[in-house]
Interface confidence: low
């Protein structure tokens, strides 16, 4: 099968170089996986000796058999068999080595369609050029953001080709990024060169804080200059507070003396004192909690007369070791509903949590979870992943504990477990979640949103979409269109308006025929690629009396890009003084490949146009 042609990431008006070799097939000398690899998943690799070549069904192989496949054996399989193997590896969650992932990727000789079924980390080794076109590349890079990019060292060719392809896919031109761009890049944002840091410091610095590896020299210099410059988001070092320094933690090594000298010394001292007293801000909580807990609470016998008969107020006077020794875990589990009414200290709650952990090492039962109350705030995402929460009442009870705060990692994990358990985001769940977190819907990935049934869209209020980016609206819009399809014109527009950031050009053209008078705030949130093909007349009909607002927005997307595509004559008919359209005497060459990348048409000035006209004239006379 012919593969898509390679394309330059940022082309000029010239024809893009053609090339169809997208996957380099390396002949790898393969070694059997070492014991450390087998040990990673706690499985010994079984010798394969042809087991992949012709099993009745690859998915029937055990993880142990799948673990040790050598590349030589994969090389002999058909593409279909390789795809089956990749899917089986994903389903059985088999941990693969970099060499195995690379080998599989090279054998998938055409762009796989079922990206969601493949092992997430395998995508890092696929050639992004094979996913050309906005839909294919969006699907590909939306998945890539969830993969562990750090499997590949920074210098690896596979990693180096991902960033430019991702930038092209998300339509990033130049070095100016929005917060949504940075989010869409996921771990690849850590690879952005210094010029991006310099131009997009306000959105990029907060992301670089959490990059796992050290920044390169170029990035460090740009970050240092941005921080010293005192621009957003952190402001001048002379105004930093302890919480600013906490927020900057991953960038502290790049600060340098001039910056450190300009931070108020009292702040530096307070921050040093706090971080030496409480190192937890630098480490995952669990790694420091357990050892400390075990040292402080030793197994000691309960003093006579102190054995707890029930969970009541008297327990607040118990020392931590007494709680450990005198409270029976089973009693605690049956009387969890009382814990919330008793003003235990956080340290005492640690002890109670520890007792429940020992009683239920595989995860708490729902009867206990429902009554956790403030003890829920002590749970880690790892604890919550062991739970099976099926009751909406349990979910509400735990969300109530966190009410008024931002969505914590614990809450996000809880919601994820609950929704996965239900199989889809039904209307009752969505109602509950958006009541507690109006921004909830927009915190989901496009893949997660795809499980929202159209019937649930009726529960969505305009403010629930406030924080959605275009990729999320792309998923929600078709569902909303389906949900509201039986409404009449004006009612339909009122309902669909919040979702229009995901509408394609055809639907905007259709709306322009219905006298909807779209306001400019809605128009400014439409997809640029959907607005570009609209004619001046269509935009005029779409906006109605609001068309006058275009003048105020002529330098902002999508209006700016749309103006560049219109003939100046047509723009002049609006009488708004819009400038920047295509002048008379210019010929528009619609090079679709180029345009998809740059978003602007290629213009030939009067010189070449005269040549074209002369040729046309000559051929007519002939």
């Amino acid at each position: 099968m012919a593969l898509p042609t390679a394309r330059p990431l940022l082309g000029s008006c010239g024809t893009p170089a053609l090339g169809s070799l997208l996957f380099l097939l390396f002949s790898l000398g393969w070694v059997q996986p070492s014991r450390t690899l087998a040990g990673e998943t706690g499985q010994e690799a079984a010798p394969l000796d042809g087991v992949l070549a012709n099993p009745p069904n690859i998915s029937s192989l055990s993880p142990r058999q799948l673990l040790g496949f050598p590349c030589a054996e994969v090389s002999g399989l058909s593409t279909e068999r390789v795809r089956e193997l990749a899917v089986a590896l994903a389903q059985k969650n088999v941990k693969l080595s970099t060499e195995q992932l690379r080998c599989l990727a090279h054998r998938l000789s055409e762009p796989p369609e079922d990206l969601d079924a493949l092992p997430l980390d395998l995508l890092l080794f696929l050639n992004p050029d094979a996913f050309s076109g906005p839909q294919a590349c969006t699907r590909f890079f939306s998945r890539i953001t969830k993969a562990n990019v750090d499997l590949l060292p920074r210098g690896a060719p596979e990693r180096q080709r991902l960033l430019p392809a991702a930038l092209a896919c998300w339509g990033v031109r130049g070095s100016l990024l929005s917060e949504a761009d940075v989010r869409a890049l996921g771990g690849l944002a850590c690879d952005l060169p210094g010029r991006f840091v310099a131009e997009s410091a306000e959105v990029l610095l907060p992301r670089l804080v959490s990059c796992p590896g050290p920044l390169d020299q170029d990035q460090q210099e740009a970050a240092r200059a941005a921080l010293q410059g005192g621009g957003p988001p952190y402001g001048p070092p002379s105004t930093w507070s302890v919480s600013t320094m906490d927020a900057l933690r991953g960038l502290l090594p790049v600060l340098g003396q001039p910056i450190i000298r300009s931070i108020p010394q009292g702040i530096v001292a307070a921050w040093r004192q706090r971080s030496s007293r409480d190192p937890s801000w630098r480490q995952p909580e669990r790694t420091i909690l357990r050892p400390r807990f075990r040292r402080e609470v030793e197994k000691t016998a309960c003093p006579s007369g102190k054995k707890a008969r029930e969970i009541d107020e008297s327990l607040i006077f118990y020392k931590k070791w007494e709680l450990e020794a005198c409270v029976d875990a089973a009693l605690l589990a049956t009387q969890m509903d009382r814990v919330n009414a008793i003003p235990f200290t956080y340290e005492q709650l640690d002890v109670l949590k520890h007792k429940l952990d020992e009683l239920y090492p595989q995860g708490y039962p729902e009867s206990v979870i429902q009554h956790l109350g403030y003890l829920f705030l002590k749970m880690s995402p790892e604890d919550i992943r062991k739970w099976n929460v099926t009751s909406l009442e349990t979910l509400k009870a735990l969300l109530e504990v966190n009410k008024g705060h931002e969505m914590s990692p614990q809450v996000a994990t809880l919601i994820d477990r609950f929704v996965k358990g239900r199989g889809q985001l039904d209307k009752d769940t969505l109602d509950t979640l958006t009541a507690f977190y109006p921004g909830y819907l927009c915190s989901l990935s496009p893949e997660e949103l795809s499980s929202v049934p159209p019937s649930s869209i009726w529960a969505v209020r305009p403010q629930d979409l406030d924080t959605c980016d275009p990729r999320q609206l792309d998923v929600l819009y078709p569902k909303a269109r389906l949900a509201f399809q039986n409404m009449n014109g004006s009612e339909y527009f009122v309902k669909i308006q919040s979702f229009l950031g995901g509408a394609p050009t055809e639907d905007l053209k259709a709306l322009s025929q219905q006298n909807v008078s779209m306001d400019l705030a809605t128009f400014m949130k439409l997809r640029t690629d959907a607005v570009l093909p609209l004619t001046v007349a269509e935009v005029q009909k779409l906006l109605g009396p609001h068309v006058e607002g275009l003048k105020a927005e002529e330098r902002h997307r999508p209006v700016r890009d749309w103006i560049l595509r219109q003939r100046q004559d047509d723009l002049d008919t609006l009488g708004l003084g819009l400038q920047g359209g295509i002048p008379n005497g210019y010929l528009v060459l619609d090079l679709s490949m180029q345009e998809a990348l740059s978003g602007t048409p290629c213009l030939l000035g009067p010189g070449p146009v005269l040549t074209v006209l002369a040729l046309l004239l000559a051929s007519t006379l002939a």
Epitope: S178, E179, A180, R183, E202, V203, P206, P232, P233, Y234, G235, S243, T244, A247, E406, M407, P438, G439, C442, S443, R461, P462, Q463, D464, D466, T467, D469, A521, M524, A552, E553, H556
Partner: nanobody
Framework: QVKLEESGGGLVQAGGSLRISCAAS????????MGWFRQTPGKEREFVAA????????YYADSVKGRFTISRDNAKNTGYLQMNSLKPEDTAVYFC????????????????????WGQGTQVTVSS
């Protein structure tokens, strides 16, 4: 770039009301979450309230819930903070702030998560 300018501050009796405004120039504020913070001498800036770009969702500090109302008029490129039942402890310089968008991983209450700031307007509540 967005430039923000607060106005409407002044002296008011305890129990009274005041409405302060934040006018934005440079570009449309409809892309921005807006927030109000306040600061008293020697203390850190304290979060007061924030509002999403459509005006559909508002967030408040516990200390002002039920007394203060944040709103915005995107057409006028202006944000507002209506302060009722004012108390002497509400005395502070009030700053208007804007941020590019709301990312659930960052807090609306952290001043360093806001991209643009005004110069502030003094509100004094006498007892």
């Amino acid at each position: 770039q967005v430039k923000l300018e607060e106005s409407g501050g002044g002296l008011v009796q305890a129990g009274g009301s005041l409405r302060i405004s934040c006018a934005a120039s440079g570009r449309s504020i409809s892309d921005y979450f807006m927030g109000w913070f306040r600061q008293t001498p020697g203390k850190e800036r304290e979060f007061v309230a924030a509002i999403s770009w459509s005006g559909g969702t508002a967030y408040y500090a516990d200390s002002v819930k039920g007394r203060f109302t944040i709103s915005r008029d995107n057409a006028k490129n202006t944000g507002y903070l209506q302060m009722n039942s004012l108390k002497p402890e509400d005395t502070a310089v009030y700053f208007c702030a804007a941020r590019l968008s709301y990312d659930s991983r960052t807090s609306l209450q952290n001043s360093y998560d806001y991209n643009y700031w005004g110069q502030g307007t003094q509100v004094t509540v006498s007892s």
